[in-house]
Interface confidence: medium
């Protein structure tokens, strides 16, 4: 439990933490562990999640071995007309688990955001809202006439129109990759995902990349030229370093960001590319993460809705990725 002994970490790689739980160095600076969450027991070895402003509250000095993860006092939040204390978690709807942290609300989707590609056993997958269920589920529409299955899949493969792309058929594997999803945050560092089977085993896998549509502190409206509908490639005036969970990018980047549209539409990335970015952490660890870089932005009406802002953020798509 304490740090007096030598470092002994499990042989297997770092644990996979649930969504929204940070992977941190234990209190002894030895092993990477999943951070304890609000209300969970903590020790010197098992620290609380620092990115949620949690600390290990040991109570009386005599009992300094086991504590409880407690939230730091910070600014409360107003969300949907309700007041939440800093550190308090709540479900904004059955689809989202949210946390108030010093005046700001962050939410994680509780429903799976997976993408299902057509396959021989499910040629027409679609998401539907089932009665009594919160999350939408995938159903496979059976075609009215079973004989249509072959042509339907062929049409999906674009063979009828364009012919197969020879680079995309590999050892009996039809390579399929979805578009990158919209960035999970409208400003600041977020995550964008896609699904592909572009791998040796032809298995569907989820890929993710960091993304930043615009810095939260940027006053980009000032950069709008008269008559322009969207700032397609506003540059931040000076090179910046990206920050991720206390780690800082090793290089500086003169990145392009999306601004605003003057006619009420949303200005979002249109053409993007994906490049690796190396982050250096305070403990000396260097991690490499793929990150979206914006080439062009475009205005559109598919804006986040007032009622379900997170849903629309997760389901909007990003086109023309160059990576």
């Amino acid at each position: 439990q304490n740090c007096s002994g030598p470092c002994r970490c499990p042989d297997e790689p770092a644990p996979r933490c649930p969504a929204g739980v940070s992977l941190v160095l234990d209190g002894c600076g030895c092993c990477r562990v999943c951070a304890k969450q609000l209300g969970e027991l903590c020790t010197e070895r098992d620290p609380c999640d620092p990115h949620k402003g949690l600390f290990c509250h040991f109570g009386s000095p005599a009992n300094r071995k086991i504590g409880v993860c407690t939230a730091k006092d910070g600014a409360p939040c107003i969300f949907g007309g309700t007041v939440y204390r800093s550190g308090e978690s709540f479900q904004s709807s059955c689809k989202y688990q949210c946390t108030c942290l010093d005046g700001a609300v962050g939410c994680m989707p509780l429903c799976s955001m997976d993408v299902r590609l057509p396959s021989p056993d499910c040629p027409f997958p679609r998401r539907v809202k089932l009665p009594g269920k919160c999350c939408e589920e995938w159903v496979c529409d059976e075609p009215k006439d079973q004989t249509v299955v072959g042509p339907a899949l062929a049409a999906y493969r674009l063979e009828d129109t364009f012919g197969p792309d020879p680079t995309m058929i590999r050892a009996n594997c039809l390579v399929q990759t979805t578009e990158w999803s919209a960035c999970s945050k409208t400003c600041g560092m977020g995550i964008s995902t896609r699904v592909t089977n572009d791998n040796a085993s032809c298995r569907l896998e989820k890929q993710s990349r960091l993304c930043m549509v615009r810095p939260c502190e940027a006053d980009l409206e000032e950069n709008i030229k008269k008559g322009k509908k969207c700032i397609r490639t506003p540059k931040i005036s000076k090179p910046i370093k990206f920050e991720l969970s206390g780690c800082t990018s090793m290089k500086t980047y003169r990145a392009k960001f999306c601004g605003v549209c003057t006619d009420g539409r949303c200005c979002t990335p249109h053409r993007t590319t994906t490049l690796p970015v190396e982050f250096k952490c305070p403990d000396g660890e260097v991690m490499k993460k793929n990150m979206m870089f914006i080439k062009t932005c475009a205005c559109h009406y598919n804006c986040p809705g007032d009622n379900d802002i997170f849903e629309s953020l997760y389901y909007r798509k990003m086109y023309g990725d160059m990576a």
């Epitope: 402003g53 600390f55 509250h57 407690t70 730091k72 006092d73 910070g74 600014a75 409360p76 107003i78 007309g81 007041v83 800093s86 942290l101 010093d102 005046g103 700001a104 939260c216 502190e217």
Partner: antibody, heavy 116, light 106 residues
């Protein structure tokens, strides 16, 4: 751009009341608490209380209970702070502020002078 | 109401490091913020959530907070850093400010 613009300077007599306004722009007014902080000449910052613009709920510092009233008009994104039974030691600059997280915004301040 | 205690003044030579402390009961259990205020101006946030710097604040400003003390450190102090500095924390649903520290650059 987030802006908090306050009303102009006031000169009041002891025992009177003063009402200071703070017009917010550049963000969703009902999504953030509005705080009022004052600073007497040559002194430090003193928190007076906050109003939740969404519900109109308030929380006042004990020192000002019974003398301060914070209200808001969401239709014009404006918060108000009224201080009654003024004394000479209420002479100060009164600030409205949005405090919390990485974005703290302050108004330019309103000088209230209490003098007979 | 809880009290946050700051030294009234701190003097520092240009290029040196200035440290301003803010002490209060179990302050490490709360988020501490720091404001810089120059004469005739509204306060400006320089540190929030104990150690984070808002956009536009130079890297020479850093913060820490544990136990009963939060500290604002200005490394490589410049003449333009001469100002009053206030610590601020939340106590449940109330906001508390420290008394302020005047930093003089000699």
């Amino acid at each position: 751009e987030v802006q908090l613009v306050q009303s102009g300077a006031e000169v009041k007599k002891p025992g009177a009341s003063v009402k200071v306004s703070c017009k917010a722009s550049g963000y969703t007014f009902t999504g953030y608490y509005m705080h009022w902080v004052r600073q007497a000449p040559g002194q430090g910052l003193e928190w007076m209380g906050w109003i939740n613009p969404n519900s109109g709920g308030t929380n006042y510092a004990q020192k000002f209970q019974g003398r301060v009233t914070m209200t808001r008009d969401t239709s014009i994104s404006t918060a108000y702070m009224e201080l009654s039974r003024l004394r000479s030691d209420d002479t100060a600059i009164y600030y409205c502020a949005r405090v919390g997280g990485s974005a703290h915004y302050w108004g330019q301040g309103t000088l209230v002078t209490v003098s007979s | 109401q809880p009290v946050l205690t700051q030294p009234p003044s701190v003097s520092v030579s240009p290029g040196q490091t200035a440290s301003i402390t803010c002490s209060g009961d179990k302050l490490g259990h709360k988020y501490a913020s720091w404001y810089q205020q120059k004469p005739g101006q509204s306060p400006v946030l320089v540190i929030y959530q104990d150690r984070k710097r808002p956009s536009g604040i130079p890297e020479r400003f850093s913060g820490s907070n544990s136990g009963n003390t939060a500290t604002l450190t200005i490394s490589g102090t410049q003449a333009m850093d001469e100002a009053d500095y206030y610590c601020q924390a939340w106590d449940s649903s109330h906001v508390v400010f420290g008394g302020g520290t005047k930093v003089t650059v000699l």
